[in-house]
Protein backbone atom coordinates (compact mmCIF):
# COMPACT_ATOMS: atom_id res chain seq x y z
CA UNK A 1 0.00 0.00 0.00
CA UNK A 2 1.28 3.51 -0.73
CA UNK A 3 1.93 5.99 2.06
CA UNK A 4 -0.79 8.61 2.12
CA UNK A 5 -1.77 11.86 3.76
CA UNK A 6 -5.44 12.79 3.62
CA UNK A 7 -7.28 15.89 4.76
CA UNK A 8 -11.02 16.01 5.12
CA UNK A 9 -12.62 19.47 5.40
CA UNK A 10 -16.26 20.50 5.58
CA UNK A 11 -18.11 23.80 5.68
CA UNK A 12 -21.82 24.30 6.25
CA UNK A 13 -24.49 26.79 5.21
CA UNK A 14 -27.87 27.36 6.76
CA UNK A 15 -30.64 28.95 4.67
CA UNK A 16 -28.13 30.39 2.20
CA UNK A 17 -25.83 31.80 4.86
CA UNK A 18 -22.38 30.17 5.16
CA UNK A 19 -21.60 29.31 8.76
CA UNK A 20 -18.37 30.48 10.34
CA UNK A 21 -15.63 27.99 10.99
CA UNK A 22 -15.16 24.54 9.47
CA UNK A 23 -14.66 20.90 10.39
CA UNK A 24 -11.44 19.06 9.59
CA UNK A 25 -9.63 15.82 10.16
CA UNK A 26 -6.30 14.40 8.95
CA UNK A 27 -5.26 10.81 8.27
CA UNK A 28 -1.75 9.46 7.84
CA UNK A 29 -1.65 6.03 6.18
CA UNK A 30 -5.34 5.68 6.96
CA UNK A 31 -4.84 6.45 10.64
CA UNK A 32 -6.42 9.56 12.20
CA UNK A 33 -3.63 11.85 13.38
CA UNK A 34 -5.20 15.32 13.35
CA UNK A 35 -8.49 16.88 14.35
CA UNK A 36 -9.50 20.51 14.15
CA UNK A 37 -10.88 21.98 17.35
CA UNK A 38 -13.61 24.40 16.20
CA UNK A 39 -13.87 26.11 19.57
CA UNK A 40 -10.15 26.78 19.96
CA UNK A 41 -9.65 27.15 16.20
CA UNK A 42 -6.59 24.94 16.33
CA UNK A 43 -5.35 21.72 14.77
CA UNK A 44 -4.71 19.14 17.48
CA UNK A 45 -3.15 15.68 17.57
CA UNK A 46 -5.46 12.69 17.44
CA UNK A 47 -4.06 9.49 18.89
CA UNK A 48 -1.23 8.99 21.33
CA UNK A 49 1.50 8.56 18.73
CA UNK A 50 0.65 11.86 16.99
CA UNK A 51 0.79 13.58 20.37
CA UNK A 52 4.09 11.94 21.31
CA UNK A 53 5.94 12.24 18.03
CA UNK A 54 4.78 15.36 16.21
CA UNK A 55 5.94 18.60 17.85
CA UNK A 56 4.19 21.92 18.55
CA UNK A 57 5.47 23.40 15.28
CA UNK A 58 3.46 20.77 13.38
CA UNK A 59 0.20 21.90 14.94
CA UNK A 60 0.98 25.58 14.33
CA UNK A 61 1.66 24.89 10.64
CA UNK A 62 -1.38 22.65 10.30
CA UNK A 63 -3.57 25.29 11.98
CA UNK A 64 -2.40 27.96 9.49
CA UNK A 65 -2.85 25.71 6.47
CA UNK A 66 -6.23 24.40 7.52
CA UNK A 67 -7.48 27.90 8.34
CA UNK A 68 -6.53 29.01 4.83
CA UNK A 69 -8.12 25.92 3.25
CA UNK A 70 -11.24 26.36 5.37
CA UNK A 71 -11.63 29.99 4.26
CA UNK A 72 -11.16 28.90 0.65
CA UNK A 73 -13.85 26.27 1.01
CA UNK A 74 -16.23 28.75 2.69
CA UNK A 75 -15.73 31.20 -0.20
CA UNK A 76 -16.40 28.38 -2.68
CA UNK A 77 -19.63 27.46 -0.89
CA UNK A 78 -20.91 31.04 -1.19
CA UNK A 79 -20.60 30.70 -5.00
CA UNK A 80 -22.75 27.57 -5.22
CA UNK A 81 -25.95 28.89 -6.74
CA UNK A 82 -28.50 26.17 -6.14
CA UNK A 83 -28.66 26.53 -2.36
CA UNK A 84 -32.24 26.15 -1.28
CA UNK A 85 -33.33 26.68 2.32
CA UNK A 86 -32.10 24.40 5.06
CA UNK A 87 -28.71 22.98 5.88
CA UNK A 88 -26.10 22.29 3.18
CA UNK A 89 -22.55 21.05 3.27
CA UNK A 90 -19.49 21.34 1.06
CA UNK A 91 -16.74 18.85 1.71
CA UNK A 92 -13.24 18.61 0.29
CA UNK A 93 -11.04 15.54 0.58
CA UNK A 94 -7.43 16.15 -0.37
CA UNK A 95 -5.02 13.23 -0.70
CA UNK A 96 -1.38 12.84 -1.63
CA UNK A 97 0.43 9.52 -1.94
CA UNK A 98 3.97 8.20 -2.23
CA UNK A 99 4.14 4.78 -3.86
CA UNK A 100 6.77 2.07 -3.40
CA UNK A 101 8.44 3.00 -6.69
CA UNK A 102 8.70 6.60 -5.35
CA UNK A 103 6.07 7.84 -7.79
CA UNK A 104 3.54 10.28 -6.36
CA UNK A 105 -0.16 10.98 -6.78
CA UNK A 106 -2.33 13.83 -5.63
CA UNK A 107 -6.02 14.50 -5.87
CA UNK A 108 -8.90 16.38 -4.32
CA UNK A 109 -12.58 15.55 -4.33
CA UNK A 110 -15.55 17.81 -3.66
CA UNK A 111 -18.92 16.74 -2.28
CA UNK A 112 -22.04 18.86 -1.99
CA UNK A 113 -24.58 17.53 0.50
CA UNK A 114 -22.59 14.29 0.54
CA UNK A 115 -22.66 13.84 -3.24
CA UNK A 116 -19.43 13.84 -5.26
CA UNK A 117 -19.49 16.48 -7.98
CA UNK A 118 -15.84 17.14 -8.84
CA UNK A 119 -12.49 15.32 -8.67
CA UNK A 120 -9.18 16.92 -9.56
CA UNK A 121 -5.80 15.39 -10.23
CA UNK A 122 -3.35 17.78 -8.58
CA UNK A 123 -0.44 16.65 -10.74
CA UNK A 124 -2.10 16.94 -14.16
CA UNK A 125 -4.83 19.44 -13.17
CA UNK A 126 -7.34 17.20 -14.96
CA UNK A 127 -10.88 17.32 -13.62
CA UNK A 128 -13.48 14.57 -13.57
CA UNK A 129 -17.17 15.31 -13.13
CA UNK A 130 -19.87 12.65 -12.59
CA UNK A 131 -22.56 12.34 -15.29
CA UNK A 132 -25.48 13.73 -13.29
CA UNK A 133 -26.77 17.15 -14.31
CA UNK A 134 -26.59 18.33 -10.68
CA UNK A 135 -22.90 17.43 -10.50
CA UNK A 136 -22.26 19.15 -13.85
CA UNK A 137 -23.97 22.35 -12.65
CA UNK A 138 -22.14 22.38 -9.33
CA UNK A 139 -18.78 21.71 -10.98
CA UNK A 140 -19.36 24.56 -13.44
CA UNK A 141 -20.29 26.96 -10.59
CA UNK A 142 -17.14 26.14 -8.69
CA UNK A 143 -14.69 26.08 -11.59
CA UNK A 144 -16.04 29.39 -12.89
CA UNK A 145 -15.44 30.93 -9.46
CA UNK A 146 -11.90 29.53 -9.39
CA UNK A 147 -11.17 30.98 -12.85
CA UNK A 148 -12.04 34.43 -11.50
CA UNK A 149 -9.62 33.87 -8.63
CA UNK A 150 -6.16 34.88 -9.78
CA UNK A 151 -4.66 32.67 -7.07
CA UNK A 152 -6.03 29.45 -8.58
CA UNK A 153 -3.31 28.94 -11.19
CA UNK A 154 -1.57 25.72 -12.19
CA UNK A 155 1.32 26.81 -9.98
CA UNK A 156 -1.09 26.98 -7.05
CA UNK A 157 -2.18 23.34 -7.53
CA UNK A 158 1.39 22.17 -7.96
CA UNK A 159 2.34 23.98 -4.74
CA UNK A 160 -0.63 22.39 -2.99
CA UNK A 161 0.60 18.92 -4.00
CA UNK A 162 4.24 19.70 -3.15
CA UNK A 163 3.22 21.00 0.26
CA UNK A 164 1.18 17.87 0.96
CA UNK A 165 4.03 15.56 -0.10
CA UNK A 166 6.52 17.50 1.97
CA UNK A 167 4.34 17.07 5.05
CA UNK A 168 3.81 13.39 4.30
CA UNK A 169 7.55 12.77 4.09
CA UNK A 170 8.16 14.72 7.28
CA UNK A 171 5.44 12.84 9.18
CA UNK A 172 6.66 9.48 7.94
CA UNK A 173 10.16 10.32 9.10
CA UNK A 174 8.85 11.34 12.52
CA UNK A 175 6.69 8.26 12.70
CA UNK A 176 9.33 5.68 11.82
CA UNK A 177 10.03 4.94 15.47
CA UNK A 178 6.40 4.24 16.30
CA UNK A 179 5.34 2.56 13.06
CA UNK A 180 6.97 -0.70 14.11
CA UNK A 181 5.07 -3.97 14.32
CA UNK A 182 2.65 -3.91 17.23
CA UNK A 183 1.25 -7.38 17.97
CA UNK A 184 -2.48 -7.63 18.64
CA UNK A 185 -4.07 -8.14 22.00
CA UNK A 186 -6.54 -10.99 21.51
CA UNK A 187 -9.50 -11.63 23.71
CA UNK A 188 -12.29 -14.19 23.44
CA UNK A 189 -15.75 -13.73 24.91
CA UNK A 190 -18.92 -15.83 24.94
CA UNK A 191 -22.55 -14.88 25.10
CA UNK A 192 -25.51 -17.22 25.32
CA UNK A 193 -27.85 -16.80 22.40
CA UNK A 194 -30.53 -19.45 22.31
CA UNK A 195 -31.32 -23.15 22.65
CA UNK A 196 -27.92 -24.22 23.79
CA UNK A 197 -26.03 -22.23 21.19
CA UNK A 198 -23.36 -19.69 22.14
CA UNK A 199 -21.88 -16.86 20.11
CA UNK A 200 -18.14 -16.74 20.63
CA UNK A 201 -16.37 -13.55 19.61
CA UNK A 202 -12.65 -13.13 19.14
CA UNK A 203 -11.39 -9.54 19.22
CA UNK A 204 -7.95 -8.43 18.13
CA UNK A 205 -6.97 -4.91 19.09
CA UNK A 206 -4.06 -2.47 19.20
CA UNK A 207 -2.14 -4.02 16.28
CA UNK A 208 -0.06 -2.53 13.48
CA UNK A 209 0.19 -2.90 10.50
CA UNK A 210 -3.44 -3.53 9.57
CA UNK A 211 -3.05 -6.88 7.72
CA UNK A 212 -4.25 -9.68 9.98
CA UNK A 213 -5.73 -13.18 9.78
CA UNK A 214 -8.35 -13.93 12.38
CA UNK A 215 -10.39 -17.12 12.12
CA UNK A 216 -12.20 -19.65 14.26
CA UNK A 217 -10.96 -23.22 14.32
CA UNK A 218 -12.75 -26.37 15.43
CA UNK A 219 -10.40 -29.16 16.56
CA UNK A 220 -7.62 -27.15 14.93
CA UNK A 221 -9.32 -26.81 11.55
CA UNK A 222 -10.59 -23.47 10.19
CA UNK A 223 -14.36 -23.15 10.08
CA UNK A 224 -15.87 -22.44 6.68
CA UNK A 225 -16.40 -18.77 5.77
CA UNK A 226 -20.16 -19.01 5.83
CA UNK A 227 -20.17 -20.03 9.50
CA UNK A 228 -18.14 -17.00 10.61
CA UNK A 229 -18.91 -13.30 10.75
CA UNK A 230 -16.08 -10.79 10.42
CA UNK A 231 -15.83 -7.17 11.43
CA UNK A 232 -13.95 -4.58 9.40
CA UNK A 233 -10.37 -3.81 10.31
CA UNK A 234 -10.75 -0.31 11.76
CA UNK A 235 -8.35 2.30 13.12
CA UNK A 236 -8.72 2.60 16.88
CA UNK A 237 -7.45 6.18 17.06
CA UNK A 238 -4.09 5.26 18.59
CA UNK A 239 -2.19 4.55 15.40
CA UNK A 240 -3.22 0.90 15.63
CA UNK A 241 -6.15 -1.23 14.42
CA UNK A 242 -8.89 -3.47 15.74
CA UNK A 243 -11.14 -6.18 14.32
CA UNK A 244 -13.23 -9.20 15.37
CA UNK A 245 -14.60 -12.54 14.20
CA UNK A 246 -17.60 -14.38 15.64
CA UNK A 247 -19.24 -17.77 15.25
CA UNK A 248 -21.99 -19.81 16.90
CA UNK A 249 -21.16 -23.04 18.68
CA UNK A 250 -23.03 -25.65 20.71
CA UNK A 251 -22.81 -25.04 24.43
CA UNK A 252 -20.59 -27.65 26.04
CA UNK A 253 -18.29 -27.82 23.02
CA UNK A 254 -16.19 -24.79 23.95
CA UNK A 255 -13.03 -26.88 24.34
CA UNK A 256 -13.08 -27.73 20.63
CA UNK A 257 -12.83 -24.12 19.49
CA UNK A 258 -9.88 -21.76 19.28
CA UNK A 259 -9.41 -18.38 17.68
CA UNK A 260 -6.40 -18.41 15.36
CA UNK A 261 -4.54 -15.17 14.74
CA UNK A 262 -1.72 -14.45 12.32
CA UNK A 263 -0.09 -11.04 12.15
CA UNK A 264 3.26 -9.88 10.71
CA UNK A 265 4.78 -13.35 10.79
CA UNK A 266 3.57 -14.07 14.33
CA UNK A 267 0.66 -16.34 15.16
CA UNK A 268 -1.27 -17.59 18.13
CA UNK A 269 -4.30 -19.62 19.17
CA UNK A 270 -6.70 -18.48 21.84
CA UNK A 271 -9.15 -20.88 23.47
CA UNK A 272 -12.75 -20.22 24.37
CA UNK A 273 -13.22 -19.69 28.11
CA UNK A 274 -14.94 -22.84 29.34
CA UNK A 275 -17.45 -23.34 32.11
CA UNK A 276 -20.90 -21.94 32.75
CA UNK A 277 -19.51 -19.13 34.88
CA UNK A 278 -17.75 -17.64 31.89
CA UNK A 279 -20.80 -17.57 29.67
CA UNK A 280 -22.17 -14.07 30.05
CA UNK A 281 -25.93 -14.50 29.99
CA UNK A 282 -26.91 -11.00 29.00
CA UNK A 283 -23.88 -9.72 27.15
CA UNK A 284 -24.82 -7.72 24.08
CA UNK A 285 -23.45 -9.11 20.85
CA UNK A 286 -23.60 -5.86 18.92
CA UNK A 287 -20.53 -6.10 16.75
CA UNK A 288 -21.06 -2.92 14.79
CA UNK A 289 -18.26 -0.44 15.37
CA UNK A 290 -19.65 2.90 14.30
CA UNK A 291 -17.18 5.46 13.06
CA UNK A 292 -17.92 8.52 15.13
CA UNK A 293 -17.66 11.73 13.13
CA UNK A 294 -15.38 14.65 13.64
CA UNK A 295 -17.67 16.51 15.86
CA UNK A 296 -21.05 16.33 17.55
CA UNK A 297 -22.31 18.62 14.84
CA UNK A 298 -22.44 15.64 12.49
CA UNK A 299 -24.71 13.78 14.85
CA UNK A 300 -26.81 16.83 15.54
CA UNK A 301 -27.14 17.96 11.97
CA UNK A 302 -27.07 14.53 10.31
CA UNK A 303 -24.42 15.55 7.79
CA UNK A 304 -23.03 12.67 5.79
CA UNK A 305 -19.26 12.52 6.10
CA UNK A 306 -17.35 10.79 3.33
CA UNK A 307 -14.33 8.78 4.47
Amino acid sequence: EPHSLRYNLMVLSQDGSVQSGFLAEGHLDGQPFLRYDRQKRRAKPQGQWAEDVLGAKTWDTETEDLTENGQDLRRTLTHIKDQKGGLHSLQEIRVCEIHEDSSTRGSRHFYYDGELFLSQNLETQESTVPQSSRAQTLAMNVTNFWKEDAMKTKTHYRAMQADCLQKLQRYLKSGVAIRRTVPPMVNVTCSEVSEGNITVTCRASSFYPRNITLTWRQDGVSLSHNTQQWGDVLPDGNGTYQTWVATRIRQGEEQRFTCYMEHSGNHGTHPVPSGKALVLQSQRTDHHHHHHGLNDIFEAQKIEWHE
Partner: antibody, heavy 118, light 107 residues
Framework: QVQLQQSGPELVKPGASVKVSCKAS????????IYWVKQSHGKSLEWIGY????????VYNQKFKGKATLTVDKSSSTAYMHLNSLTSEDSAVYYC???????????WGQGTLVTVSA | DIQMTQTTSSLSASLGDRVTITCSAG??????LNWYQQKPDGTVKLLIF???SLQSGVPSRFSGSGSGADYSLTISNLEPEDIATYYC?????????FGAGTKLELK
Protein backbone atom coordinates in the same frame (compact mmCIF):
# COMPACT_ATOMS: atom_id res chain seq x y z
CA GLN B 1 7.30 -30.61 2.78
CA VAL B 2 5.48 -31.54 5.98
CA GLN B 3 6.97 -34.56 7.74
CA LEU B 4 6.20 -36.27 11.04
CA GLN B 5 8.96 -38.59 12.19
CA GLN B 6 7.98 -40.92 15.00
CA SER B 7 10.25 -42.76 17.46
CA GLY B 8 11.06 -46.43 16.98
CA PRO B 9 9.26 -49.55 18.26
CA GLU B 10 9.01 -50.16 22.00
CA LEU B 11 8.81 -53.41 23.93
CA VAL B 12 7.68 -52.71 27.49
CA LYS B 13 6.59 -54.69 30.53
CA PRO B 14 3.05 -54.55 31.93
CA GLY B 15 2.66 -51.77 34.50
CA ALA B 16 5.46 -49.74 32.98
CA SER B 17 5.10 -46.56 30.95
CA VAL B 18 6.34 -45.39 27.59
CA LYS B 19 6.87 -42.08 25.82
CA VAL B 20 6.36 -41.94 22.06
CA SER B 21 7.78 -38.95 20.19
CA CYS B 22 6.76 -37.24 16.95
CA LYS B 23 9.17 -34.74 15.43
CA ALA B 24 7.59 -32.26 13.03
CA SER B 25 9.37 -30.52 10.16
CA UNK B 26 8.49 -28.56 7.02
CA UNK B 27 6.07 -26.13 8.68
CA UNK B 28 5.71 -23.81 11.69
CA UNK B 29 5.18 -26.31 14.51
CA UNK B 30 3.09 -24.05 16.76
CA UNK B 31 0.58 -23.23 14.00
CA UNK B 32 -1.22 -26.57 13.90
CA UNK B 33 -2.50 -29.20 16.32
CA ILE B 34 -0.89 -32.59 16.75
CA TYR B 35 -3.35 -35.49 16.94
CA TRP B 36 -2.72 -39.00 18.24
CA VAL B 37 -4.45 -42.15 16.98
CA LYS B 38 -4.26 -45.78 18.17
CA GLN B 39 -4.55 -48.87 15.98
CA SER B 40 -4.66 -52.21 17.73
CA HIS B 41 -3.47 -55.19 15.66
CA GLY B 42 -5.89 -55.91 12.82
CA LYS B 43 -8.33 -53.35 14.18
CA SER B 44 -9.62 -49.92 13.27
CA LEU B 45 -8.34 -46.49 14.28
CA GLU B 46 -9.17 -44.79 17.58
CA TRP B 47 -8.64 -41.10 18.28
CA ILE B 48 -6.76 -40.53 21.54
CA GLY B 49 -6.61 -36.75 21.73
CA TYR B 50 -4.88 -33.66 20.41
CA UNK B 51 -2.61 -30.89 21.60
CA UNK B 52 -2.22 -27.29 20.50
CA UNK B 53 1.56 -26.75 20.43
CA UNK B 54 1.16 -22.98 20.73
CA UNK B 55 -0.25 -23.02 24.24
CA UNK B 56 -0.14 -26.69 25.26
CA UNK B 57 -3.95 -26.93 25.37
CA UNK B 58 -5.18 -30.51 25.16
CA VAL B 59 -8.43 -32.28 24.32
CA TYR B 60 -8.73 -36.00 25.08
CA ASN B 61 -11.05 -38.81 24.15
CA GLN B 62 -12.67 -39.64 27.52
CA LYS B 63 -11.62 -43.28 27.00
CA PHE B 64 -7.93 -42.32 27.10
CA LYS B 65 -8.04 -39.80 29.95
CA GLY B 66 -5.65 -40.99 32.61
CA LYS B 67 -3.97 -43.35 30.16
CA ALA B 68 -2.38 -40.89 27.74
CA THR B 69 -0.72 -37.53 28.45
CA LEU B 70 0.12 -35.25 25.55
CA THR B 71 2.94 -32.70 25.70
CA VAL B 72 5.13 -30.71 23.32
CA ASP B 73 8.63 -29.30 23.25
CA LYS B 74 8.43 -26.20 21.10
CA SER B 75 12.20 -25.76 20.94
CA SER B 76 12.62 -29.07 19.13
CA SER B 77 9.24 -29.07 17.32
CA THR B 78 8.46 -32.40 18.95
CA ALA B 79 5.20 -33.74 20.33
CA TYR B 80 5.10 -36.52 22.92
CA MET B 81 2.53 -39.02 24.09
CA HIS B 82 3.14 -40.62 27.48
CA LEU B 83 1.25 -43.86 28.14
CA ASN B 84 1.19 -45.17 31.71
CA SER B 85 0.23 -48.36 33.59
CA LEU B 86 0.54 -50.37 30.41
CA THR B 87 -1.39 -53.60 29.84
CA SER B 88 -1.64 -55.92 26.85
CA GLU B 89 -4.67 -53.83 25.75
CA ASP B 90 -2.27 -50.97 25.06
CA SER B 91 -0.25 -53.01 22.54
CA ALA B 92 -0.85 -51.19 19.27
CA VAL B 93 0.59 -48.96 16.59
CA TYR B 94 0.32 -45.30 17.63
CA TYR B 95 0.20 -42.58 15.00
CA CYS B 96 0.67 -38.85 15.29
CA UNK B 97 -0.91 -36.62 12.66
CA UNK B 98 -1.23 -32.91 11.94
CA UNK B 99 -3.41 -30.63 9.85
CA UNK B 100 -2.98 -28.02 7.14
CA UNK B 101 -5.60 -25.93 8.95
CA UNK B 102 -8.34 -26.95 6.51
CA UNK B 103 -8.80 -30.68 7.11
CA UNK B 104 -8.23 -33.04 10.04
CA UNK B 105 -5.36 -35.56 10.05
CA UNK B 106 -3.91 -34.18 6.82
CA UNK B 107 -0.43 -35.57 7.38
CA TRP B 108 0.47 -38.74 9.31
CA GLY B 109 3.60 -40.08 10.96
CA GLN B 110 4.78 -43.57 10.02
CA GLY B 111 3.48 -45.06 13.28
CA THR B 112 5.19 -46.43 16.39
CA LEU B 113 4.60 -50.04 17.45
CA VAL B 114 4.28 -50.44 21.22
CA THR B 115 4.28 -54.03 22.46
CA VAL B 116 3.38 -54.74 26.07
CA SER B 117 4.64 -58.15 27.10
CA ALA B 118 6.04 -59.79 30.19
CA ASP C 1 -20.17 -41.60 20.88
CA ILE C 2 -21.18 -41.56 17.22
CA GLN C 3 -20.84 -45.07 15.81
CA MET C 4 -19.46 -45.25 12.26
CA THR C 5 -20.45 -48.39 10.36
CA GLN C 6 -18.70 -49.71 7.27
CA THR C 7 -20.86 -52.75 6.53
CA THR C 8 -18.47 -54.22 3.97
CA SER C 9 -15.29 -55.27 5.73
CA SER C 10 -13.64 -56.51 2.55
CA LEU C 11 -14.28 -56.02 -1.14
CA SER C 12 -12.80 -57.70 -4.22
CA ALA C 13 -12.57 -55.80 -7.48
CA SER C 14 -10.71 -55.87 -10.77
CA LEU C 15 -8.41 -53.19 -12.17
CA GLY C 16 -10.42 -50.57 -14.04
CA ASP C 17 -13.56 -51.26 -11.98
CA ARG C 18 -15.70 -48.59 -10.40
CA VAL C 19 -15.70 -49.27 -6.68
CA THR C 20 -18.01 -47.74 -4.06
CA ILE C 21 -17.38 -48.03 -0.32
CA THR C 22 -20.16 -47.00 2.05
CA CYS C 23 -20.23 -45.66 5.57
CA SER C 24 -23.14 -44.80 7.83
CA ALA C 25 -23.15 -42.77 11.01
CA GLY C 26 -25.26 -43.48 14.10
CA UNK C 27 -26.82 -40.01 13.61
CA UNK C 28 -26.70 -37.11 11.16
CA UNK C 29 -23.19 -35.65 10.99
CA UNK C 30 -23.74 -32.59 8.74
CA UNK C 31 -21.21 -33.73 6.11
CA UNK C 32 -18.42 -33.67 8.71
CA LEU C 33 -16.84 -36.78 7.23
CA ASN C 34 -13.36 -37.66 5.98
CA TRP C 35 -11.97 -40.69 4.14
CA TYR C 36 -8.49 -42.15 4.72
CA GLN C 37 -6.46 -44.76 2.90
CA GLN C 38 -4.13 -47.12 4.78
CA LYS C 39 -1.65 -49.04 2.67
CA PRO C 40 -0.50 -52.58 3.68
CA ASP C 41 2.78 -51.07 5.01
CA GLY C 42 0.76 -48.96 7.50
CA THR C 43 1.09 -45.63 5.68
CA VAL C 44 -2.04 -43.48 6.18
CA LYS C 45 -3.20 -40.78 3.79
CA LEU C 46 -6.15 -38.35 3.80
CA LEU C 47 -8.17 -38.68 0.57
CA ILE C 48 -11.40 -36.73 1.02
CA PHE C 49 -12.45 -34.16 3.62
CA UNK C 50 -15.84 -32.63 4.39
CA UNK C 51 -17.65 -35.40 2.48
CA UNK C 52 -16.57 -34.45 -1.03
CA SER C 53 -13.51 -32.17 -1.04
CA LEU C 54 -10.54 -33.86 -2.67
CA GLN C 55 -7.33 -33.44 -0.70
CA SER C 56 -4.52 -31.82 -2.67
CA GLY C 57 -2.38 -34.39 -4.53
CA VAL C 58 -5.08 -37.10 -4.48
CA PRO C 59 -5.99 -38.47 -7.95
CA SER C 60 -9.34 -37.32 -9.32
CA ARG C 61 -10.57 -40.91 -9.67
CA PHE C 62 -11.42 -40.65 -5.96
CA SER C 63 -14.65 -38.89 -5.07
CA GLY C 64 -16.92 -38.65 -2.05
CA SER C 65 -20.61 -37.98 -1.58
CA GLY C 66 -23.42 -38.28 0.92
CA SER C 67 -25.46 -36.35 3.47
CA GLY C 68 -27.22 -36.84 6.78
CA ALA C 69 -25.95 -40.18 8.10
CA ASP C 70 -25.02 -41.94 4.85
CA TYR C 71 -21.80 -41.42 2.92
CA SER C 72 -19.76 -43.09 0.23
CA LEU C 73 -16.31 -43.11 -1.36
CA THR C 74 -16.03 -43.98 -5.05
CA ILE C 75 -12.94 -44.99 -7.01
CA SER C 76 -13.94 -44.56 -10.64
CA ASN C 77 -11.19 -46.60 -12.29
CA LEU C 78 -9.34 -48.93 -9.93
CA GLU C 79 -5.55 -48.82 -10.16
CA PRO C 80 -3.06 -51.29 -8.59
CA GLU C 81 -1.87 -48.67 -6.07
CA ASP C 82 -5.44 -48.34 -4.72
CA ILE C 83 -5.21 -51.72 -2.99
CA ALA C 84 -5.53 -50.67 0.66
CA THR C 85 -7.95 -50.39 3.58
CA TYR C 86 -10.28 -47.37 3.57
CA TYR C 87 -11.63 -45.71 6.70
CA CYS C 88 -14.34 -43.12 7.15
CA UNK C 89 -14.18 -40.73 10.12
CA UNK C 90 -16.67 -38.24 11.57
CA UNK C 91 -15.82 -34.95 13.26
CA UNK C 92 -19.32 -33.70 13.99
CA UNK C 93 -19.00 -34.51 17.70
CA UNK C 94 -16.30 -35.57 20.12
CA UNK C 95 -14.92 -38.12 20.39
CA UNK C 96 -13.78 -38.23 16.78
CA UNK C 97 -14.62 -41.74 15.57
CA PHE C 98 -13.59 -43.97 12.67
CA GLY C 99 -15.36 -46.74 10.81
CA ALA C 100 -14.03 -50.32 11.09
CA GLY C 101 -12.49 -50.07 7.63
CA THR C 102 -13.10 -51.69 4.24
CA LYS C 103 -10.24 -53.73 2.84
CA LEU C 104 -10.03 -53.53 -0.94
CA GLU C 105 -8.49 -56.56 -2.65
CA LEU C 106 -7.84 -57.55 -6.25
CA LYS C 107 -10.01 -60.30 -7.74
Amino acid sequence: QVQLQQSGPELVKPGASVKVSCKASGYAFTKYNIYWVKQSHGKSLEWIGYIDPYNGGTVYNQKFKGKATLTVDKSSSTAYMHLNSLTSEDSAVYYCATTDGYSLFTYWGQGTLVTVSA
Amino acid sequence: DIQMTQTTSSLSASLGDRVTITCSAGQGINNYLNWYQQKPDGTVKLLIFYTSSLQSGVPSRFSGSGSGADYSLTISNLEPEDIATYYCQQYSKLPLTFGAGTKLELK
